[in-house]
Every structure is written in structure tokens, then in C-alpha cells.
Interface confidence: low
């Protein structure tokens, strides 16, 4: 059988070559009939056996931490037969470690992040080393862990590599911190070897800073012409924190006139003054207003830092401006009837000027040929006023102060031309009507109806009669239906187209006004030669045909 | 040696969501940083963004409002995902390494894929 | 962003005269970190130099980089025809990483 011991070959060995050990058959009696060979990976360039005595030798440096073992297979052949004198085995080549690897920390560069003015304790981060070497030989991969610079706000527990906090540290005095850790192999004994590393402590922000005013006392203006909204200037606080922790809120907090507000500019964290209600510089010209600010998130922990929000003090200057002449009324509303003289009274408008100085104040109506304003206001006819031709007027009056001219106010006023009974009634279209000559007594020949331009206060009311003449020539009679039209009928059986063709009836048409006016309209009726049912169609055509130049047979 | 091949779909509608796989061969997606540019049709090299093996991402800002890269360590792959596409996005995208190891700054990168083209269109 | 401008647009020589092609940066590329690409037609781009003059394992020494701060520099000392082809600059030196337009290099 096979002989031999466990093989190791120390890693690092300097010398050109290194006996191994010794491969041996127990059949061999030393007479050198046996050839012994190697094979495998290494067989050949790192082991070299003498074929003869089976010595292995190791011919290169080996290094234990890019290979650790090389597993090779043995052969013993007997020369004078060329039979194998043992069957083929295999056999491990050990490379045993020496302490040649410095601790390394791989996933640098570390970086941590930690809350300011965390307590003593607190965990930072773990780092941790890597030695290559064999953790099962001897102290070769076991490591202590040591602070080289952080002191005194950091420690590192010499076994896991857990950097902790041990004094509290001021964000806004210094806000990250370079601290280098070492890792020694060897539990730290003589001729260990180490390795370092840098960990950036950032210390992240927390609100332990409240927003203070710049300034105690801010002046500023506004016009007393300003909008309400209007941004009339800007108060700034700082605040040593930052990012979120440094957000702040402005708010009023005294103002009895109630007229301004303070809004948040959140990009530029100042507070913006605005006016809430328009501001008269005539009424009062100054304001004291006082504001503070707080920050937008504060954790309730940290409300110790808060306790008192910071002031400041605004004064308001109201500016004056020359404001236009100002009307009592926004709009005025005036009646006057129709057909009044020239000259006529219609109403008065007043403006005064708002300001200190009271200017006197100039009217004028803008493109009015109809009616008048004089200084006083007193708006007067310049012509009669017809209802029925324009109901209503739409003025433009303006104001404008004598002292600065332009300083110009203007407001509607609207004018309602009252109405008087100064139109009668009359037909509402022309009526040209037909008769046959066989026609009976009674027969309907048309129906009228009236119209009237004046205005009514309630329901117009018409009254038809036929006139004083046409009521004793009785051919005609007339009813009125009591609803503003009415009939005219035959008053006789048969009508003779060639004596008398066409008759001109006088109708009269009253209102029910006061006075009562009375129109004479005149209907003109055609008699025609109609057929037996008695349609006065065939004589409508016949007139049209005439009036058109033609003959009928 | 190390090898990259991008799969994906060629063609994807407008407004819909592009998605493209970039998958590791020949070596380990641990310790290196991975990054997918794009190259319009006869145009230049857009980066588009990393991911670390970690899970870490780092996106161009002129897409990270429609970005999303991710990593599947088990399969040694990592993922890009372009909402809302448009024509413009069509392109050659291209998956590649940073040639420095473990953490640290950016790097060239010494290792491509060959490239997917995809197409945006209805 | 760092916006690398290159120049020129098109380069139009012949096998064996020497290439100089320029990379502009907008602002100072920290750390020299510049790297040059070159691309094939139907080619991925391959890494040339990185770090604005180490060259990446494998490329021919007639290629060489220089330069600093925003002007950077791809020589190719005696043209080949195999390196006709388009190249491109890239900072990644600050984020987001960032390539020029690119320099057509075209036989006369």
C-alpha cells in the first residue's frame, strides 16, 4: 500500500525549492525499479517529485490566501514491467498559513449619518475588517478594533467594530467629523499587522434652533391707493438650523386695526406684510402692528428650544395720494315726463373731494345734446323729450376736481321719460277689404285691430264707431268685440259693382287715456262680381291683375 | 471574461413603459457599479443612470422623474424601467460597468453589451 | 450638467498621419476624470483611456490622452484604417455623467 504523513507546505517560503514529503509503496525495497509520477493541477510547475525516490518539492513561493490546498494524484509504476506496482491515489497538499495579510476594511469609504446632540451611547455605525489570512491558525484573523482619531466624541468597541457616540455633539458648531479606525490582527500582540480606515460622521440637523427677527423694528410704507393684497414689504428672521428645521411661519400677532397680514414666503423663508383692508391715509395715517415667527415643525421634544417665539415691531406709514372726487351715490336714477319744456328740472348729482384740501368740483355730461349740468350738479332739458322716440337715457356725468383737473370721477345716470296720452290709436296695418255684389246682410266683411305708441299704465283700452256719415249711409255697420279689434259686417242684402264699386268707410278709434285722444282711419271695401258660393278669392285676383296691367274676361 | 446582454421588447407604444433586462455573465454583479446609456439614431451617448449591486441608484436628472433601475442579485441581473415614453425615447439602449471595484467614485466603463434597440411608436 | 463640447465635428485623414482630436468641458472636470470611447458602426462604444491619459488594457500605444481641468486631448500618433470610426469624450467627474457629440473620424 501507500505510505505517507499529512503534507504542508508554509505559504511565503523564500526558498527555491522545498521538500514536501515523500510519496512510498511499502513494496519498495529501494532498488530503484519503482518510478513514481505526480499528477493534477501544480503537478509539474509548483511540486516537482523525484521520480525515483518519490520526494515531492515545492518550487515556487505559495501563497496560502489565493490557494490553500492542491489536490494531486499519486502513480507508482514498476520500470522492468511497466505495470502499476499501486493503484493510482489521490493526496491533499496543505499550504499552512503565516500571518502575512493586514486587516482590510472593503466596503469603504463609510460614510454615517446622526442626528445632533445625540445622547452618549448612541450607535453610529459598525465597521468591519477583513483579514485573508486563516482565521483557524492561531491569532493570524482575529482583530481588535481602536479609535486614532475622534476623540472624545467617539469610541469603537475593540471586538465588533461599533462606533459609538460618547459626548454630544453641536450641529451648528461643527457639522461632520473625520474619525479613522484601526483593525489589528493578532488580537493585538506582537508583530500584528493593521489596517485603517476613515469614517465621515455628518451630523444631520434637529430643530434645537428657533427663528429669531433680524431687526426689532421694521418701517415701512403703503399708499394709501394700494389694493387690499398688496405686498407692502418684507420681514426676515433667521434660524441657525436648516432644510425643514429651518422652515418658519410668520403671523400677526398685534394688530387692532385688524388691516394687514403676514404670509409665508416658504422659498425665501421671509414674511411678506399685506394689506388686508384699503388703508385711508385721510382716516389714519399710521399703524403699529407686531409680528413673530415660529418654525413649521417642531417635534415635541424639542419644544424646550421654542419656548418663547421671537417679535419684531412694524410701523406703517400711510402714504397720501390725490384720490378723484368721489359721488354720494354709485349710479342715479331720474324721471321726467314727455314733452316738458326746454329748461326742465331733472336732478342733481353731488361729488365732493375726498382729500384734506376739499377742491371745489366741476360736472360735465359726456356726448348729451339733450340735457344740461351745472355746477351745482343740477342736471336740466336742452330740447323736448319725446317717449316714443327714447324712453330712457343713459348719461355719463363727470366730476373733476378744479385744483388738479386730472383727478376725474365718473358715474351712470339714468333718466326715464315718463309717459303722457299724446297718441291716439290707430289701425295696426292697412286693410283693403271685399264684398261680393250678392252678399247678405250681416255677412262679416273684415276684422280690424288698433294699435297705440303711447305707453299704457295699465291695459290700453280701444272704442270703434264708424263716423256720424258713414253710420247714416247704413250699407256698413260695426261691432267692437271689446278686445282692442272689431268686425265689420253688411248692413243691406246686395251690392252693385257697377254703380258703386268701392266704398270708403270712416272708422274712428279712441283710447281709454285721459284726455281720451280719437283717430278717423278710412277702410276702403271693393265690391266684386263673385261666384255662387259667394268667395271673394276670384275678386282678390281680379284686383291684382288690374293693379298688374292685366284684363280679365 | 465578464459579458452583457440587454433583452427587451423592440417596440413600445407611446406613453406606455419601457422595460429592459441587462444580464451578467461570466462574473459577479457584487461589487461593481452598473449603468445604462441610450444613443438616439445617429445621435450621441446619454447616460441615463447606476445601480449598485446593494440596490443604491443614481439617475440622470433629466429623466429621474420617469426612471427606475433595479437589481436581482440572484440572477446577477439589473433592470431599467422608462415610464411615459414618448418618440423621442427611441434609441439604441446600452448596458455596461464601471471598471472599478467595490465603492468608491464613477468610472469609465470598460465593459458594454452590444446594445437593444428599441423603438416608440403606435 | 458638464456639457463637453468636441472638436472637430468631422475629421477627414489618411492612413498613417497623426489624429488630434479636442474635448471641451463647460466647467473643470474634477480628478482628470475623462475617459475616450471609440465606436463602430453596428459596435457598442469600446473604453480607450480613462483618467484623461492611462489607456485601457488592450489598446494599441499609438493612442494616447492628455489634459486637464476642461481641455482634453485623444492623439492617435500614425492612423490605421481600423481606427476610422466616430469617438467620443465622457466626464465622470461630477453628476450626471456626460459625453461629448462626438468627432467623426473619416478616411480622406
Known amino acids: 500500500g501507500w505510505v505517507w504523513n499529512q503534507f504542508f507546505v508554509p505559504e511565503e517560503m523564500n526558498t527555491t525549492s522545498h521538500h514536501v514529503g515523500r510519496l512510498r509503496s511499502d513494496l519498495d525495497n529501494g532498488n530503484n525499479s519503482f518510478q513514481y509520477k505526480l499528477l493534477g493541477a501544480g503537478a509539474g510547475s509548483t511540486f516537482i517529485i523525484d521520480e525515483r525516490t518519490g520526494d515531492i518539492y515545492a518550487i515556487e513561493k505559495l501563497d496560502r490566501e489565493e490557494r490553500s490546498l492542491y489536490i494531486l494524484r499519486a502513480q507508482v509504476i514498476d520500470i522492468t514491467t511497466g505495470r502499476a506496482v499501486e493503484p493510482e491515489s489521490e493526496f491533499v497538499i496543505k499550504v499552512s498559513d503565516i500571518n502575512d495579510n493586514e486587516p482590510k476594511f472593503l466596503d469603504e469609504p463609510y460614510e454615517a449619518i446622526v442626528p445632533e446632540m445625540s445622547p452618549e451611547g448612541t450607535l453610529v455605525i459598525q465597521v468591519t475588517a477583513s483579514d485573508a489570512d486563516d482565521p483557524s491558525s492561531g491569532n493570524n484573523a482575529r482583530l481588535l478594533y481602536s479609535l486614532l482619531q475622534g476623540q472624545p466624541y467617539f469610541s469603537v468597541e475593540p471586538t465588533t467594530g461599533v462606533i459609538r457616540i460618547s459626548s454630544k455633539m453641536d450641529r451648528e458648531l461643527q457639522d461632520e467629523y473625520w474619525v479613522i479606525i484601526q483593525a489589528k490582527d493578532m488580537i493585538g500582540q506582537p508583530g500584528a499587522l493593521s489596517g485603517t480606515t476613515s469614517v465621515l460622521i455628518k451630523l444631520s440637523d434637529v430643530n434645537d434652533n428657533k427663528p429669531i427677527f433680524k431687526e426689532s423694528l421694521y418701517r415701512l410704507t403703503v399708499s394709501e391707493s394700494a389694493p387690499t393684497g398688496t405686498s407692502i414689504g418684507t420681514i426676515m428672521a433667521y434660524d441657525n438650523d436648516i432644510g425643514e428645521n429651518a422652515e418658519m411661519d410668520y403671523s400677526i400677532e398685534e394688530d387692532d386695526s385688524q388691516t394687514f397680514d403676514i404670509i409665508t414666503n416658504h422659498e425665501t423663508q421671509e414674511g411678506i406684510v399685506i394689506l388686508k383692508k384699503k388703508v385711508n391715509f385721510e382716516h389714519q395715517n399710521h399703524y403699529g402692528i407686531r409680528a413673530k415667527v415660529k418654525n413649521h415643525h417642531v417635534d415635541k421634544q424639542l419644544m424646550k428650544y421654542h419656548t418663547e417665539a421671537s417679535t419684531t415691531f412694524i410701523k406703517i406709514q400711510v402714504e397720501d395720494v390725490d384720490e378723484p372726487p368721489l359721488f354720494l351715490l354709485p349710479y342715479y336714477i331720474f324721471e321726467i315726463f314727455e314733452e316738458t319744456p326746454q329748461g326742465s328740472f331733472v336732478g342733481v348729482v353731488s361729488a365732493t373731494d375726498p382729500d384734506n384740501r376739499k377742491s371745489p368740483i366741476r360736472y360735465s355730461i359726456t356726448r348729451s345734446k339733450v340735457f344740461n349740468i351745472d355746477d351745482n350738479g343740477t342736471i336740466t332739458t336742452t330740447n323736448s323729450l319725446d317717449r316714443e322716440i327714447s324712453a330712457w337715457y343713459n348719461l355719463s356725468i363727470t366730476a373733476t376736481e378744479k385744483y388738479n383737473i386730472e383727478q376725474i370721477s365718473s358715474i351712470p345716470v339714468y333718466v326715464q321719460v315718463l309717459n303722457i296720452n299724446d297718441h291716439a290709436p290707430e289701425f295696426s296695418q292697412y286693410y283693403e277689404s271685399y264684398v261680393c255684389e250678392n252678399a247678405g246682410s250681416g255677412q262679416v266683411i273684415q276684422t280690424i285691430s288698433a294699435v297705440d305708441r303711447d305707453e299704457s299704465i295699465e291695459e290700453h283700452h280701444f272704442y270703434f264707431n264708424l263716423s256720424v256719415e258713414d253710420t247714416n249711409s247704413s250699407s256698413f255697420t260695426i261691432i267692437d268685440n271689446q278686445d282692442n279689434t272689431a268686425v265689420i259686417l253688411t248692413n243691406r242684402t246686395g251690392f252693385n259693382l257697377q254703380e258703386e264699386p268701392i266704398f270708403y268707410i270712416s272708422i274712428l278709434i279712441a283710447d281709454n287715456g285721459i284726455p281720451s285722444l280719437t283717430s278717423t282711419n278710412t277702410l276702403t271695401i271693393h265690391v266684386c262680381d263673385c261666384d255662387d258660393s259667394g268667395s271673394t278669392q276670384t275678386c282678390q285676383y281680379q284686383e291684382l291683375m288690374l293693379s298688374m296691367g292685366f284684363k280679365t274676361e | 471574461q465578464v459579458q452583457l446582454q440587454e433583452s427587451g421588447p423592440g417596440l413600445v407604444k407611446p406613453s406606455e413603459t419601457l422595460s429592459l433586462t441587462c444580464t451578467v455573465s461570466g462574473g459577479s454583479i457584487n461589487s461593481y457599479y452598473w449603468s445604462w446609456i441610450r444613443q438616439p439614431p445617429g445621435k450621441g451617448l446619454e447616460w441615463i443612470g447606476y445601480i449598485y449591486y446593494i440596490g443604491s441608484t443614481n439617475y440622470n436628472p433629466s429623466l429621474k422623474s420617469r426612471v427606475t433601475i433595479s437589481v436581482d442579485t440572484s440572477k446577477n441581473q439589473f433592470s431599467l424601467k422608462l415610464s411615459s415614453v414618448t418618440a423621442a425615447d427611441t434609441a439604441l439602449y446600452y448596458c455596461?460597468?464601471?471598471?472599478?471595484?467595490?465603492?468608491?467614485?464613477?468610472?469609465?466603463?470598460?465593459?458594454w453589451g452590444q446594445g437593444t434597440m428599441v423603438t416608440v411608436s403606435s | 450638467d458638464i456639457v463637453l463640447t468636441q472638436s472637430p465635428g468631422t475629421l477627414s485623414l489618411s492612413p498613417g498621419e497623426r489624429a488630434t482630436l479636442s474635448c471641451r468641458a463647460s466647467?473643470?472636470?474634477?480628478?482628470?476624470?475623462l475617459a475616450w470611447y471609440q465606436q463602430k458602426p453596428g459596435q457598442a462604444p469600446r473604453l480607450l483611456i480613462s483618467?484623461?491619459?492611462s489607456r485601457a488594457t488592450g489598446i494599441p500605444d499609438r493612442f494616447s490622452g492628455s489634459g486637464s481641468g476642461t481641455d482634453f486631448t485623444l492623439t492617435i500618433s500614425r492612423l490605421e484604417p481600423e481606427d476610422f470610426a466616430v469617438y467620443y469624450c465622457?466626464?465622470?467627474?461630477?453628476?450626471?455623467?456626460?459625453f461629448g457629440q462626438g468627432t467623426r473620424l473619416e478616411m480622406k
Open positions: 465622457q466626464q465622470y467627474g461630477k453628476s450626471p455623467i456626460t
Open positions: 466647467q473643470s472636470v474634477a480628478g482628470s476624470y
Open positions: 455596461a460597468r464601471d471598471s472599478r471595484y467595490r465603492s468608491g467614485w464613477y468610472d469609465a466603463f470598460d465593459i
Open positions: 483618467g484623461a491619459s
